[in-house]
Every structure is written in structure tokens, then in C-alpha cells.
């Protein structure tokens, strides 16, 4: 699981980035107008996307394979990487341009300013990710996803700074899940929710995701969860893998991970 | 299956503010945004405005924006209306009003409604 | 504002008689749904998205229409459809009802 080259295995497109969103009509693909678009919107306390806020999206990993109305009457779509079925081969915001017929039917792109952002892919040798809203709680049914990216031979070292999810069991309500790979899929690490603060971990290679869920019911403190590049060192040096299982109801952990 | 129960009839003085309930059952109350609509007497229904309940974010009918105050508490799955400097022109029957978030909306479940009476 | 007229305001009608009522818009709609409120009582979703019936709702009821004329057909009236049906649009802030179509029985 490593990015080298500038190709990366797998692809994990973001739902929703940097306050930008798609949406269709309640009866599917293609069926709204401009000014339907720009209902859709509003209704839900935003407005259409301009084309630079769609960009800003797609430069953090905003991939959707459908023409949507943007503002002032554009109509495109966000392609991150090339694929056969959509783009045409290529990236970047695919551009039907200003539509002269604002009867046309297409998707929207809209654009929240207040909505409480979360995830996305990021290549900093440093972040700090937090739960939406923190240090307020954080809402009910979200999903986020923080892929993480680093420079080929590099590896990942990741602490807890705060750490409060509901509690229970088997964390099937609200948790977070790490992975050692740029999927949710592949390369499982742990489970996490409860109060207690996890150990730190640290990546096999130079790609890691945290996937963060809440249910419909409950919530509570949040988290902040730091990570930092770390450089290749000689194999002597290097952290131990091990396998741990924890069948306690703070943390449920499986899989293989780096251990500090 | 889907249940809007609303507070019971409420009487108010002209000038004093009411809070009126709607909790909801069956269904995922995030899930769906919740409207309001007034029925005067022998008269027909108005829209008044919308809480999606995720959010929170509100948008009321111009008409209502000063009157009414839409609220929502996740943990109980209950909305909220307060209605404020009440005239007699605010009694009616308030209904909350389930829809889905696709547009365009509907609603596609009713609360029984709240008779409020506003008399000195 | 879109402002929905519904005609006639008040209509009567003989069991197995035909019945259609209208709802024009000031503004073109997608779709159009119509509700029905029998007194004292909650409305009742009865058509959504102009032709599709809501559950529970007899076969005998039908919706058409586009843009900004709708209608809502009863083919065969029975006393039970005795009611007030409203017209009412969800594509443009503010939503708006139409004031109504008493249906009585002849």
C-alpha cells in the first residue's frame, strides 16, 4: 500500500469536501433545472457551488460521476482520478460550461459554508484531525473518512490527544476505526470508542485511514487525533509489529498494527 | 409505523408565548426534516417553516419569522415550536409535518395537531 | 410566492359520478401533491408527485397535469370520498397549499 509516482492502489472518493456536496432530485438523476438546483440549496441553508469552490473540493478528494449546476448557470463535474466511464480520461472539473438553457436538467452541486466539515485526504507531514465540531459533541449519524498520504518510505505515527465516543460492548454505536491502507478494506488496525486514551500507532507503510461513525442516538466529547510523517529509519530501528486483540468495552482492537 | 405525537390543547393570554411538542417514533428522526403548518378554523393550511433535525438549520415562511421558533432535541426525537406575542389571530391547529429530504418535498406523515386558543 | 388556485372551491357529486378538480400555479412546478382532510381530523397525503397514489388510497383516485396545471380525478364517486382536498407544491420557498376543494355528496 504505497503511493509512489503519483498513483495510489485504491480510491476512496469523498462524499462531501471543503463544504461542497452533490445532490439529485428525490426521483434520481438529472432532473433538475437551474433554478431547481438552486432551490435544492437553499432549502438546506446553502447555495450552488462556484466553480473554485468545486476545485477546492475535488484537490481533496471530491469525485462524483455526475454533471451537476453550479452558480451562475455551469454545469460540471469533479473527476480526481481518470477512469474509463467518466471524465473522459481526464482530471480535474470536467466543464459543459454556462448552459444558455437554464431548463435543462441537470444534478446540483451546493456548497454549505456552516456545514461542520470532516475528513478528507491529506499529505501534510502533520495533522491534526478532529471530530466535527470539537470541542463541542459531535452529531449524530456522521461518517467521516481521513485518508492519509505521505511520501513513499515514509511511515505514520499516530496519537490520541482526546478520545470520548459513546460507550459500548462491541463500539457498534459511535467509534473510530483505523486502517493500514488507503481503504477502509484492507490492513484492519482497531475499533475504538469509549473514554480511554488508545496507543499510539504507527503505519506499516506510507498510507493509513481513519474512519470515524456515529449512530442516530447519543453522543459525546469527540476526539482529536494527531498524526506526524515520520522518515525512514534502517530496519533495526523500526517499531515492532504485533497482533493484539481487546475484548474490553473502551477499545476494540483486531488486526495487525505498529505498537510505540 | 411512523407516529408525530403532538402536545395536548393549550389556552393562552395575548401577549405570552407557548411551546408546542411533536415526538416522533418509528422512524430515524435525523433522517427527515419536520415541518409545521397552521389550519385556522374553517379555514385552509398555511406552511410555516422546517427544522432538519441533523443540522438543526431552520427556514420559516416570511410571514412567521418572527413568531415562530422551530427546535429540535435529537435524544428524545421530539421538535419544537414556540410561538411568541401571541394574538388571537394564533389560534388555530398547529400539525408538525414529516417529509423526506428529496426534493421536492412532501410530507408524508401528519401529527394529530395542537388546538391552540388564544382568549383573555 | 407560489400561489396555488384550486377550482371549484366547493363541488358536489352523485355516488358513481366522475369527478375532477383542478390546481393551477403561478409558478411551473415539477410535481404537484394533493391531500385530503375530512373534518376534524389530520390531513392525509393522497397523491404525490402528480400521479402516484399514496398508500391506502382507492384505485379510483387519479393525478395529472404539468407545469402549472395539475388535477386530481375521482372516476367513480362514493360517499366515503366526501372531503376537502388540497393541492399543494414543494419545489419553491414558501411551500404553498391551495385553499381547498370541498367535495360534498349530492
Known amino acids: 500500500w504505497g503511493f509512489k509516482d503519483g498513483i495510489f492502489h485504491n480510491s476512496i472518493w469523498l462524499e462531501r469536501a471543503a463544504g461542497v456536496y452533490h445532490r439529485e432530485a428525490r426521483s434520481g438523476k438529472y432532473k433538475l433545472t437551474y433554478a431547481e438546483a438552486k432551490a435544492v440549496c437553499e432549502f438546506e441553508g446553502g447555495h450552488l457551488a462556484t466553480y473554485k469552490q468545486l476545485e477546492a473540493a475535488r484537490k481533496i478528494g471530491f469525485h462524483v460521476c455526475a454533471a451537476g449546476w453550479m452558480a451562475k448557470g455551469r454545469v460540471g463535474y469533479p473527476i480526481v482520478k481518470p477512469g474509463p466511464n467518466c471524465g473522459f480520461g481526464k482530471t480535474g472539473i470536467i466543464d459543459y460550461g454556462i448552459r444558455l438553457n437554464r431548463s435543462e436538467r441537470w444534478d446540483a452541486y451546493c456548497y454549505n459554508p456552516h456545514a461542520k466539515e470532516c475528513g478528507g485526504v491529506f499529505t501534510d507531514p502533520k495533522q491534526i484531525f478532529k471530530s466535527p465540531g470539537f470541542p463541542n459533541e459531535y452529531e449524530d449519524n456522521q461518517i467521516c473518512y481521513w485518508h492519509i498520504r505521505l511520501k513513499y518510505g515514509q511511515r505514520i505515527h499516530l496519537s490520541f490527544l482526546d478520545f470520548d465516543l459513546e460507550d459500548d460492548p462491541g463500539c457498534l454505536a459511535d467509534y473510530v476505526e483505523i486502517y493500514d491502507s488507503y481503504d477502509d478494506v484492507h490492513g484492519f488496525v482497531g475499533r475504538y470508542c469509549g473514554d480511554e486514551l488508545p496507543d499510539d500507532i504507527i503505519s506499516t507503510g506510507n498510507v493509513m485511514t481513519l474512519k470515524f461513525l456515529s449512530d442516530a442516538s447519543v453522543t459525546a466529547g469527540g476526539f482529536q487525533i494527531k498524526y506526524v510523517a515520520m522518515d525512514p529509519v534502517s530496519k533495526s530501528s523500526q517499531g515492532k509489529n504485533t497482533s493484539t486483540t481487546s475484548t474490553g468495552n473502551k477499545n476494540f482492537l483486531a488486526g495487525r498494527f505498529s505498537h510505540l | 409505523q411512523v407516529q408525530l405525537q403532538q402536545s395536548g390543547a393549550e389556552l393562552a393570554k395575548p401577549g405570552a408565548s407557548v411551546r408546542l411538542s411533536c415526538q416522533a417514533s418509528?422512524?430515524?428522526?435525523?433522517?427527515?426534516?419536520m415541518h409545521w403548518v397552521k389550519q385556522r378554523p374553517r379555514q385552509g393550511l398555511e406552511w410555516i417553516g422546517y427544522?432538519?433535525?441533523?443540522?438543526?438549520?431552520?427556514k420559516c415562511h416570511q410571514k412567521f419569522k418572527d413568531k415562530a421558533t422551530l427546535t429540535a432535541d435529537k435524544s428524545s426525537s421530539t421538535a419544537y415550536m414556540q410561538l411568541s406575542s401571541l394574538t388571537y389571530e394564533d389560534s388555530a391547529v398547529y400539525y408538525c409535518?414529516?417529509?423526506?429530504?428529496?426534493?421536492?418535498?412532501?410530507?408524508?406523515?401528519w401529527g394529530q395537531g395542537t388546538t391552540l386558543t388564544v382568549s383573555s | 410566492e407560489n400561489v396555488l388556485t384550486q377550482s371549484p372551491a366547493i363541488m358536489s357529486a352523485s355516488p358513481g359520478e366522475r369527478v375532477t378538480m383542478t390546481c393551477s400555479a403561478t409558478s411551473s412546478v415539477s410535481f404537484m401533491h394533493w391531500y385530503q382532510q375530512k373534518s376534524s381530523t389530520s390531513p392525509k397525503l393522497w397523491i404525490y408527485?402528480?400521479?402516484k397514489l399514496a398508500s391506502g388510497v382507492p384505485g379510483r383516485f387519479s393525478g395529472s397535469g404539468s407545469g402549472n396545471s395539475y388535477s386530481l380525478t375521482i372516476s367513480s364517486m362514493e360517499a366515503e370520498d366526501v372531503a376537502t382536498y388540497y393541492c399543494?407544491?414543494?419545489?419553491?420557498?414558501?411551500?404553498?397549499f391551495g385553499a381547498g376543494t370541498k367535495l360534498e355528496l349530492k
Open positions: 427544522i432538519i433535525p441533523s443540522s438543526g438549520y431552520t
Open positions: 418509528g422512524y430515524t428522526f435525523t433522517s427527515y426534516w
Open positions: 409535518a414529516r417529509s423526506t429530504s428529496g426534493y421536492p418535498y412532501y410530507f408524508d406523515s
Open positions: 399543494f407544491q414543494g419545489s419553491w420557498y414558501p411551500l404553498t
Open positions: 408527485d402528480t400521479s
